[in-house]
């Protein structure tokens, strides 16, 4: 029978690294880290860690029994757990039956949004105490809210991950800006900065109808030329308070109606860390 | 039944590079590793190198790391050694040699002999 | 890299005879060790891998022992076809190295 591997989680030292030996298995040739998906009751889904290692082809591989890895986790808080991947048979050959080296894989380790990720695997038994074994180490970084698949996680929604402001922008004179766009029922407050090098002209906006989408209007005063400027839209939503998903625009002159005219160039851009 | 048959005897001037075939048969080609080990005229043998014909990964013995290429080719179940710079020690044959579950050699090539002469 | 001594480089032995070879690694090889037959002009042929285990189609009159660096190649009763080079090689982990060889002649 090919070997597979049994994963259980293991905090402390391995016992092996109590014991003298002789001789240990190599290195691992390869590890790598991608992200997937997993749904969850909530209707939600959970975003895990895929962890894959390769063997080294050679028979220093008659000696693993297991692989450990750890994982080490650094946002606003640091997080560490570790697991232990027993092989469920010895190793008769140095790659597999078909052809290539023997890879496995453990999926796992909870991701959490915009956390950078430090991935450690080892052989058992290793080195002995005061020695230092042959180890594996990646890093990987977890995408924010703006993600093509963490977009969708319920506290990315609640940040604002899927709404589009629809942000147009037009300069009125001289000393106005016209700033619409499409509110949420996320969220009743919204900032409203025009930037043009330097901030030019911000105002509050209050939506009070927060349960349906309105299209707000406000009128901003800027002291410099807004033509060109930078519109930057920041909603205020209790999930993530002032480090809500900003968006942006850009301000055109209005046509002679006064009527705004739409943008395609609206943009999106994570306020900070996202939640 | 497997077999590994290499191609014919050289003559090269030292400076030169030789290319060496071994076409295998009678077992899965990407399944095990090809070793290449060379003897002197009246010496022992000495291992070259190794390739993994699944995805091309290549050892080498650091004696011979600058000179030596492996490569292969799974269209038709053939592996290639090809040696640079040949010098006149660099004559011996040369044989292929297929790992078995692990870097013992279970099946040979009949061996290439290669000339270096000016 | 390991190193591989053989002993004796030569021998002289009659049909029927007792023939120990032996080989020492450089370091703990872990039983990864295999025999060949070599004979003037072939390939060399596997006789044994993993110390004890004989190939295909090798005859019952070879064996292997040891562990750690000392190994041995017995050949129980030799046969006229048994005059030939035999080589000692170790798999534990590239670079491979092989023994000097031990060249059995007939007496």
């Known amino acids: 029978r090919e070997p597979t591997v049994q994963c259980g989680s293991e905090t402390g030292p391995s016992p092996e690294w109590m014991l003298q030996h002789d001789l240990i298995p190599g290195d691992l040739r390869d590890l790598r880290v991608e992200p997937v998906t997993t749904s969850v009751a909530t209707g939600d889904y959970s975003i895990l860690m895929n962890v894959s290692w390769v063997l080294r082809a050679d028979a220093s591989i008659r000696l693993l029994k297991a692989t450990k890895i750890c994982v080490t986790g650094k946002s606003n808080f640091q997080s560490y757990s570790c697991v232990r991947c027993n092989y469920t048979e010895a190793f008769q050959t140095q790659t597999r039956p078909s052809g290539g080296k023997w890879t496995f894989s453990y999926i796992g380790f909870p991701v959490e949004l915009n956390t950078v990720y430090f991935i450690g695997a080892h052989n058992i038994p290793n080195a002995n105490m005061n020695e230092d074994g042959p180890s594996m180490s990646v890093n990987f970084t977890s995408p924010g809210c703006l993600d093509h698949i963490m977009k969708y996680k319920k506290k990315c929604v609640k940040a604002g991950s899927l709404w589009d402001p629809n942000i147009t922008a037009c300069k009125k004179n001289e000393e106005t800006v016209e700033v619409n766009f499409t509110t949420t029922p996320l969220g009743n407050r919204y900032m409203a900065l025009i930037q043009h090098s330097t901030i030019i002209g911000f105002s509050q906006v209050f939506e009070p109808h927060q349960k349906k989408q309105t299209r707000a209007s406000v009128v901003i005063p800027v002291t410099g030329d807004s033509e060109g400027a930078t519109v930057q839209l920041t909603p205020y939503f209790p999930t993530c308070g002032s480090d809500c998903i900003r968006h942006k625009g850009t301000v055109v002159l209005c046509p002679q109606t006064g009527v705004p005219f739409p943008l395609d160039n609206n943009k999106s851009k994570p306020g900070g860390w996202l939640p | 039944e497997v077999q590994l048959v290499q191609s014919g005897a050289e003559v090269k001037k030292p400076g030169a590079s030789v290319k060496v075939s071994c076409k295998t048969s009678?077992?899965?080609?990407?399944?095990?590793?090809m070793n290449w080990v060379r003897q002197a005229p009246g010496q022992g043998l000495e291992w070259m190198g190794r390739?993994?014909?699944?995805?091309?990964?290549?050892q080498y013995n650091q004696k011979f790391k600058d000179r030596v290429t492996l490569t292969r080719d799974t269209s038709i179940s053939t592996a290639y050694m090809e040696l640079s710079r040949l010098r006149s020690d660099d004559t011996a044959v040369y044989y292929c040699?297929?790992?078995?579950?692990?870097?013992?050699?279970?099946?040979w090539g009949q061996g290439t002999l290669v000339t270096v002469s000016s | 890299d390991i190193q591989m001594t053989q002993s004796p480089s030569s021998l002289s032995a009659s049909v029927g005879d007792r023939v120990t070879i032996t080989c020492r690694a450089s370091?703990?090889?872990?039983?990864?060790l295999a025999w060949y037959q070599q004979k003037p002009g072939k390939a060399p042929k596997l006789l044994l891998y993993?110390?004890?285990n004989l190939a295909d189609g090798v005859p019952s009159r070879f064996s292997g022992s040891g562990s750690g660096t000392d190994y041995t190649l017995t050949i129980s009763s030799l046969q006229p076809e048994d005059f030939a080079t035999y080589y000692c090689?170790?798999?534990?982990?590239?670079?491979?190295?092989f023994g000097g060889g031990t060249k059995v002649e007939i007496k």
């Open positions: 370091e703990n090889i872990n039983s990864n």
């Open positions: 390739i993994d014909p699944y995805d091309s990964e290549i």
């Open positions: 993993d110390v004890t």
């Open positions: 040699a297929r790992s078995g579950g692990f870097d013992w050699f279970a099946y």
């Open positions: 090689q170790h798999f534990w982990g590239p670079p491979y190295t």
């Open positions: 009678g077992y899965t080609f990407i399944s095990y590793w």
